[in-house]
């Protein structure tokens, strides 16, 4: 399963390009631009599982830092500040990582 099985390559390219500048990442705008916001719950979960590289059932902080690479391999890494901001937004239960339901909520709230 690759990201382009769920999202269009064109939308991915546009969204990655829009946040190419350092410290410009805004997860709400990104999820909208990449087309994730309008996907159904099962498709959102598929995206989660792609981003969960080590199949732990969670997107941990280091995986969050490379979240853009999960959409496009040539994308940049998030800065430490961007990563912390994203983690704080998504980690509802305070365990330091984002589970599938938390990710779904994060997308839905975008």
């Amino acid at each position: 399963m690759s990201m382009t099985d769920v999202l269009s390559a064109e939308d991915i390219k546009k969204a990655i390009g829009a946040f190419a500048a350092a410290d410009s990442f805004d997860h709400k705008k990104f999820f909208q631009m990449v087309g994730l916001k309008k996907k159904n719950p099962d498709e959102v979960k598929k995206v989660f599982h792609i981003l969960d590289k080590d199949k732990s059932g969670f997107i941990e902080e280091d995986e969050l830092g490379s979240i853009l690479k999960g959409f496009s391999s040539d994308a940049r890494d998030l800065s430490a500040k961007e990563t912390k901001t994203l983690l704080a937004a998504g980690d509802k239960d305070g365990d330091g990582k984002i589970g599938v339901e938390e990710f779904s909520t994060l997308v839905a709230e975008s």
Epitope: D54, G57, D62, D93, D95
Partner: antibody
Framework: EVNLVESGGGLVQPGGSLRLSCATS????????MSWVRQPPGKALEWLGF??????????EYSASVKGRFTFSRDNSQSILYLQMNTLRTEDSATYYC????????WGQGTSVTVSS | DIQMTQSPSSLSASLGERVSLTCRAS??????LNWLQQEPDGTIKRLIY???ILDSGVPKRFSGSRSGSDYSLTISSLESEDFVDYYC?????????FGGGTKLEIK
């Protein structure tokens, strides 16, 4: 296809040393935590610890039962995990497994270690 | 350390029967719990991760759930290859800990 293959098990005398290897393929090794788990004959699984991924500086965590005697290392260029076991005791006799990922989603087939005089 | 108390330690059941295995966590582990299957030759395979996510290729008769500190693995209709050993594993905090295991035997 993900593959983990342990090797290096065998018979060793109490007080002796042994190094186990876990050759891996099919996943981004440097992104993965790698664990060692053992199972004494007829008993439950026991987690020995892990070596973290590149993002966490390949730092290690050990269980109390092996801390100070066992050492984890990894060759990231070859995607191989190692377990150096020193001052072995009879109670270290077990099948040793390597496991990949923070959720231990990938497992090797195990290698048997017998510590006996 | 977090203790994982797994029950029952052994279970006799018939083909087609529905069975549930349980692990109780001594401290909060959130959803950081896996269920593993071990065959007689020692081969270990993860069935369920993060409490309820089915691993790729695992039959849909397996499912995982949680009620408070109790975590369950349910097999909806036992097949012959299911009569092996099962372990839970918590990976919420170090040291990661396993349950004592359940041996599932054919009646």
């Amino acid at each position: 296809e993900v593959n983990l293959v342990e090797s290096g098990g065998g018979l060793v005398q109490p007080g002796g040393s042994l190094r186990l290897s876990c050759a891996t393929s099919g996943f981004p090794f440097t992104d993965f935590y790698m664990s060692w788990v053992r199972q004494p004959p007829g008993k439950a699984l026991e987690w020995l610890g892990f070596i973290r991924n590149r993002a966490h500086g390949y730092t290690t965590e050990y269980s109390a039962s092996v801390k100070g005697r066992f050492t984890f290392s990894r060759d990231n260029s070859q995607s191989i995990l190692y377990l150096q076991m020193n001052t072995l005791r009879t109670e270290d006799s077990a099948t040793y497994y390597c496991g990949g990922g923070r959720g231990l989603g990938y497992w090797g087939q195990g290698t048997s270690v017998t510590v006996s005089s | 350390d977090i203790q994982m108390t797994q029950s029952p330690s052994s279970l006799s059941a018939s083909l087609g029967e529905r069975v549930s295995l349980t692990c109780r966590a001594s401290q909060d582990i959130g959803s950081s719990l896996n269920w593993l299957q071990q065959e007689p030759d020692g081969t270990i395979k993860r069935l369920i991760y993060a409490t309820s996510i089915l691993d790729s290729g695992v039959p849909k008769r397996f499912s995982g759930s949680r009620s408070g500190s109790d975590y369950s693995l349910t097999i909806s209709s036992l097949e012959s290859e299911d009569f092996v050993d099962y372990y839970c594993l918590q990976y919420a905090s170090s040291p990661w800990t396993f349950g004592g295991g359940t041996k599932l035997e054919i009646k």
